[in-house]
């Protein structure tokens, strides 16, 4: 449900999109999660706009959000996590646009950390593990993460894979030998909680070794 | 239209055990959070369990804590409560509830449940 | 854990106003948001009041809810009152994931 100004004052507000999205991040901070919203369209003038959360609340019927810069932000442990949060543009008193959104269901994993990849010679293959903050958390434990690796001179080639351990193994017959290769990763949530992919973790390169075998070939990637 | 239909009461010894079903229709289930409230005969509402839209979050009053179990089937838009242990301070109509986009509920008709030896 | 505490019964004549109160025994009442359910004999609980004093589509606007901090009370005020009012009504509220209900007050239109 969407309400508008009203309001002479607010004629012009009234011609703008308000339209804006938002994600969650559950126990980013200890128990502290946190909400960030932000309007799709880049232009909108922000001067005198705020945002409002109602509803699914412990203990309060409504917290307003803090600006930092573009986006709105909040850090609470006051999300009850049951039903859905009437979340408003406000201009004053005026909502010019609400969304009601269950929180558990935009929820934005942490970018997965410690991404590294071992060669294994006896192999011939390569283990790549990383970790993410998610194993310690009570609520969003459960992610499906993609692994991307490209040669390096391939700037759109990536090869994705999708995995739900912290651990792959990459055959080296796949990769092309003696080549530069980058990798990431990135989460998304996969059980009970719906949402957004994760930012992806910063990447990782490593080299291919040369080939050794006697007949000199590899499966191309 | 919101339709809840709860079904499976019915006569129980003491120390028995019972499984209800509330049948969902009219509305988008799997995004709904769903409670169980019973009303003893002559008596007030009685909260006893929610469940989130996807099953993970569930909560219990004090009074069926650890013999009641709240489920739900989104497959099938289908809410349960399986009730062991059952005691004779359990008899009541008993209802579910769907809670709307905030707390506006929807409720069914209940189904009796009567322990009783 | 807090309690919501309702009076037993009220009465009003028909076209008259009547007002039920909701006290909350511990906490703000402005803390979490407060529904009122009506209940006719042999039936369901309908919602008449959500959100304090949101009304669902349907119901008239004979029925308006509010809250009075300094009270720490929720009320629920029914005017030109019916016959079909005569009921029993149930505040709610929310206490972390539990909820709370009111016993109830039995409303008699004499």
């Known amino acids: 449900e969407s309400g508008y100004a009203q309001n002479g004052d607010l004629e012009d507000a009234e011609l703008d999109d308000y339209s804006f999205s938002c994600y969650s991040q559950l126990e980013v901070n200890g128990s502290q999660h946190s909400l960030t919203c932000a309007f799709e369209d880049p232009d909108v003038n922000i001067t005198n706009l705020e945002f409002e959360i109602c509803g699914a609340l412990v203990e309060v019927k409504c917290l307003n959000f803090r600006k930092l810069q573009e986006i709105y932000f909040i850090e609470t442990k006051k999300f009850l996590l049951i039903g859905k949060s009437n979340i408003c543009v406000k201009v004053g008193e005026k909502s010019l646009t609400c969304k009601k959104i269950d929180l558990t269901t935009i929820v934005k994993p942490e970018a997965p950390f410690d991404l590294s990849v071992v060669y294994r010679e006896g192999a011939n293959d390569f283990v790549v593990t990383f970790n993410t903050s998610h194993l310690q958390k009570k609520y969003v434990k459960v992610l499906m993460h993609d692994v991307a690796y490209r040669q390096e001179k391939d700037e759109n080639k990536w090869t994705h894979v999708n995995l739900s351990s912290t651990k792959l193994t990459l055959l080296q017959r796949k990769l092309q030998p003696a080549a530069m290769y980058e990798i990431k990763v990135r989460s998304i949530p996969d059980h009970y909680f719906k949402g957004f992919w994760s930012e992806w973790s910063p990447s990782y390169y490593f080299r291919t070794p040369e080939i050794n075998n006697s007949s000199g070939e590899m499966d191309p990637i | 239209q919101v339709n809840l239909r709860e079904s499976g009461g019915g006569l129980v010894k003491p120390g028995g055990s019972l499984r209800l079903s509330c049948a969902a229709s009219g509305f988008t289930f799997d995004d709904s959070v769903m409670h169980w409230v019973r009303q003893a005969p002559g008596k007030g509402l009685e909260w006893l369990s929610l469940v989130g839209w996807d099953g993970f979050f569930t909560y219990y009053a004090d009074s069926v804590k650890g013999r009641f179990t709240i489920s739900r089937d989104n497959t099938k838009n289908l809410l349960y409560l399986q009730m062991n242990s059952l005691r004779a301070e359990d008899t009541a109509v008993y209802y579910c509830?769907?809670?709307?986009?905030?707390?506006?509920?929807?409720w069914g008709q209940g189904t009796l449940v009567t322990v009783s030896s | 854990n807090f309690m919501l505490t309702q009076p037993h019964s009220v009465s009003g004549s028909p076209g008259k106003t009547v007002t039920i109160s909701c006290t909350r025994s511990s906490g703000s009442i402005d803390s979490s948001y407060v529904q009122w359910y009506q209940q006719r004999p042999g039936n369901s609980p309908t919602t008449v009041i959500y959100?304090?004093?949101?009304?669902p589509s349907g119901v008239p606007d004979r029925f308006s809810g509010s809250i009075d901090s300094s009270s720490n009370s929720a009320s629920l005020t029914i005017s030109g009152l019916v016959t079909e009012d005569e009921a029993d009504y149930y505040c709610?509220?929310?206490?972390?994931?539990?909820?709370?209900f009111g016993g109830g007050t039995k409303l008699t239109v004499l």
């Open positions: 709610q509220s929310y206490d972390f994931h539990h909820l709370v």
């Open positions: 959100e304090d004093d949101q009304r």
């Open positions: 509830a769907r809670q709307g986009d905030y707390m506006g509920n929807n």
